[in-house]
Structures are given as C-alpha cells and as structure tokens.
Interface confidence: low
C-alpha cells in the first residue's frame, strides 16, 4: 500500500477529505482575520498559510462578511460571554451541539460555529493560553466532521455557502 504522504487522497468538492480540507482552510483564515483585527498582530496566530484559489477566496470573503453581521447578534454574544474557559473542551462541544440540537442544519449555523470558535480563540489570547488556538480549531473541525460533514456533502460542498448567502455586490 502506498500513501506515506497526506493520507487517503482527495476527490471532488463533495468528497469528505475535500470538505474537511476546505473547512480547515476557511476556519484558519476566519480565525486569523477576526483575531488579527481584534487583537492586532499576534505572533501566536501565525500558522502556516494555505494556498487560496479563487473559489476559497470568495468563500473566505463571504465568511468575513457574515462574521461582521454576527457581531451584532445579541443572543450569540450572550451565549459566548457565558462560556467558562476553565473546561473549554466540554463547553465547546456542548455549545456546538446546542446549535444543532433541533436537527435543523443551515449555513448560518455552520458559520456561527466558526464564529464561536474564533471568539474562543480571542478569549484564549486574552487569557494568555495561545496553545488553545490549534486545539480549538481541532475541536471545531472534529465537530464539523462528526455532525456536519454529511449535510455539507448534501449541499454540494462549501460552494453551497455562496448560494445560500449570495455574492456581495462589492466582489
């Protein structure tokens, strides 16, 4: 058997591997963008940069725009403010599960999950726990794989995000 490089290959936009890979790129970019704007230049956030193709760039810009809108979502802000960073793993998965507890999936909630992760990262930076950053990314993508992957596949992959939110006029 071969495959000593990156494991198990990848396929089209709806393959598990491609969705997770794009999700990882988008999440990292989203967190770096938001944390960078809030906390200024943070060396802890200087993770390796994935190459961005035109499609991923569009998706990143779409996420950035929605993230800005979520800043004014009071319900989400309250939920995030209540997070106890003493046991962040348990809290993360509980809040993430609560977001989808009713069994209804939509792109808004997927983005809210990313937004929640970025807020946790900011909390981690503020409380001098930079090692939590990669960990929080791992949790978010674990949750995405366990609970959201099949749904994202059913939407035709990440491209469905663009059609759901529409392409902003300034693009």
């Amino acid at each position: 058997m071969d495959g000593s490089g990156e494991q198990l290959g990848s396929g089209g936009p709806t393959s598990s591997e491609q969705i997770m890979k794009t999700g990882a790129f988008l999440l990292q970019g989203f967190i770096q963008d938001r944390a960078g704007r809030m906390a200024g230049e943070t060396p802890e956030l200087t993770l390796e940069q994935p190459p961005q193709d035109a499609s991923t760039k569009k998706l990143s810009e779409c996420l950035r725009r929605i993230g800005d809108e979520l800043d004014s979502n009071m319900e989400l802000q309250r939920m995030i403010a209540d997070v106890d960073t003493d046991s962040p793993r348990e809290v993360f998965f509980r809040v993430a599960a609560d977001m989808f507890a009713d069994g209804n999936f939509n792109w808004g909630r997927v983005v809210a999950l990313f937004y929640f992760a970025s807020k946790l990262v900011l909390k981690a930076l503020c409380t001098k726990v930079p090692e939590l950053i990669r960990t929080i990314m791992g949790w978010t993508l674990d949750f995405l794989r366990e609970r959201l992957l099949v749904w994202i596949q059913d939407q035709g992959g990440w491209e469905g995000l663009l059609s759901y939110f529409g392409t902003p006029t300034w693009q």
């Epitope: 490089g5 393959s15 890979k21 990292q28 791992g138 674990d142 794989r145 366990e146």
Partner: antibody, heavy 127, light 107 residues
Framework: EVQLVESGGGLVQPGGSLRLSCAAS????????MHWVRQAPGKGLEWVAS????????YYADSVKGRFTISADTSKNTAYLQMNSLRAEDTAVYYC????????????????????WGQGTLVTVSS | DIQMTQSPSSLSASVGDRVTITCRAS??????VAWYQQKPGKAPKLLIY???SLYSGVPSRFSGSRSGTDFTLTISSLQPEDFATYYC?????????FGQGTKVEIK
C-alpha cells in the same frame, strides 16, 4: 517505505508494568495521529488509545483509562504505550497503527482510519 | 460510547459470489467509518475509509456504502484471497470502536 515496528511485549505478572514501543520510519510521526489496537487470542480488534503528537491530544478506551498512558517522542519518531496495573484480560497482541495526516491545523477527515499497521507484539499477563 | 453491531458473525461463500457485510451504529454517526481485512496471524489491512472511499491499492471489487446508521461492505465477486475476517470501525469525537468481525469462509 512506511514501516511500524513494535517491541516491548512479553510475559508479566498481574499488577505488573510493561512499556511498548512503536518505531516509525518512512514518515514524520509528528504529523500523523497514532493508535494502539489490541487483539486477545481468538478475539476481535479492540481500540486501546490514540495520540495526536502535533496537539498532544491523547484518547483512551474506558477499559484502560487510568492504567495505560500513550505518548510519543517525535525526536525518536517513536510512539509508546506504558501499561501499568496489568490484568489477565489485557493479554493480547498489541498493534500500533498510523492514522490521519495533519494539515493546516487539522488531522484530516480520515484521521480515524488506520492505513499502516505494525506486525504486533504479544503481551501475556499471567502468574 | 457508540457500538458497532456487525452481521453476520460468519458466512460461507464460494469464489465468484457477491458478499455483503453490515455494521449498524448504535446511534447516528458521521461517515467516519472504515473497513479492514485481517488474515490469521497478520495485521489488519485498510480497505475502505469515510464509509465509501476505496483505499489506494485495494481492488475495486471492494466497496462501501452508508444508509442512515447502517454501513455495508460489499465484495462484488469473491476471490480466493478474500477469505479472511472483516472488521468495521467507527470514530466519534476521536473515540474508536470496532465491530465484532465477520469471518468469510469457503463453502
């Protein structure tokens, strides 16, 4: 060529300890999740523990939690399983296996799938 | 923890037969399911990952599918070298469980 070689198995008395090693070659262990899986004589496969060296995450089956410790020394490209308070029911062939590759902050969606396995090392717990 | 109930525990088949093995998850899981083949005295070999993706180097007669909480491994035309024990495996939040195994024997 990817290779995993286990060592450290043997006969031990109940309540005793053993440390298993899994020497990896052909890839950088830092960027893969690693797993230990055991198989009691004539029985099926049982997952024991996993580690993601990049994060330092460790995970354990309930049956070994508190008794076994998984670790990795990335400078030696080796994973370990420290087994304490051994019981007769821990008797098995212990395999180490490689899981998913790490990229951009994430162990890939195939991280649970074990694509390379060692030859196994037999641990016998008996008085 | 999520349990994987594998059936049948054993089956007898002839070369050329179509063979189907099923694993049922005790609760809803993602497609984080893999299938392995093991021969006596040997380490398991990965056949299928992500429920339906064929691992490199594995013959195309092996395929995997998913329907709800049921995961199926199909061997379209059994070959002499396919007589072995097959295991399914799932991961939920990095906790892994294997099915009990299915022994495929010569009829």
């Amino acid at each position: 060529e990817v290779q995993l070689v286990e060592s450290g198995g043997g006969l031990v008395q109940p309540g005793g300890s053993l440390r298993l090693s899994c020497a990896a070659s052909g890839f950088n262990l830092s960027y893969y999740s690693m797993h230990w899986v055991r198989q009691a004589p004539g029985k099926g496969l049982e997952w024991v523990a996993s580690i993601s060296p990049y994060y330092g995450y460790t995970y354990y089956a309930d049956s070994v939690k508190g008794r076994f410790t998984i670790s990795a020394d990335t400078s030696k490209n080796t994973a370990y399983l420290q087994m304490n308070s051994l019981r007769a029911e821990d008797t098995a062939v212990y395999y180490c296996a490689r899981g998913g590759a790490y990229y951009f902050g994430y162990y890939g969606s195939g991280s649970y799938a074990m694509d390379y396995w060692g030859q196994g090392t037999l641990v016998t717990v008996s008085s | 923890d999520i349990q994987m109930t594998q059936s049948p525990s054993s089956l007898s088949a002839s070369v050329g037969d179509r063979v189907t093995i099923t694993c049922r998850a005790s609760q809803s899981v993602s497609s984080a399911v893999a299938w392995y083949q093991q021969k006596p005295g040997k380490a398991p070999k990965l056949l299928i990952y992500s429920a339906s993706s064929l691992y490199s180097g594995v013959p195309s007669r092996f395929s995997g599918s998913r329907s709800g909480t049921d995961f199926t491994l199909t061997i379209s035309s059994l070959q002499p070298e396919d007589f072995a024990t097959y295991y399914c495996q799932q991961s939920s939040y990095s906790l892994i469980t294997f099915g009990q195994g299915t022994k495929v024997e010569i009829k």
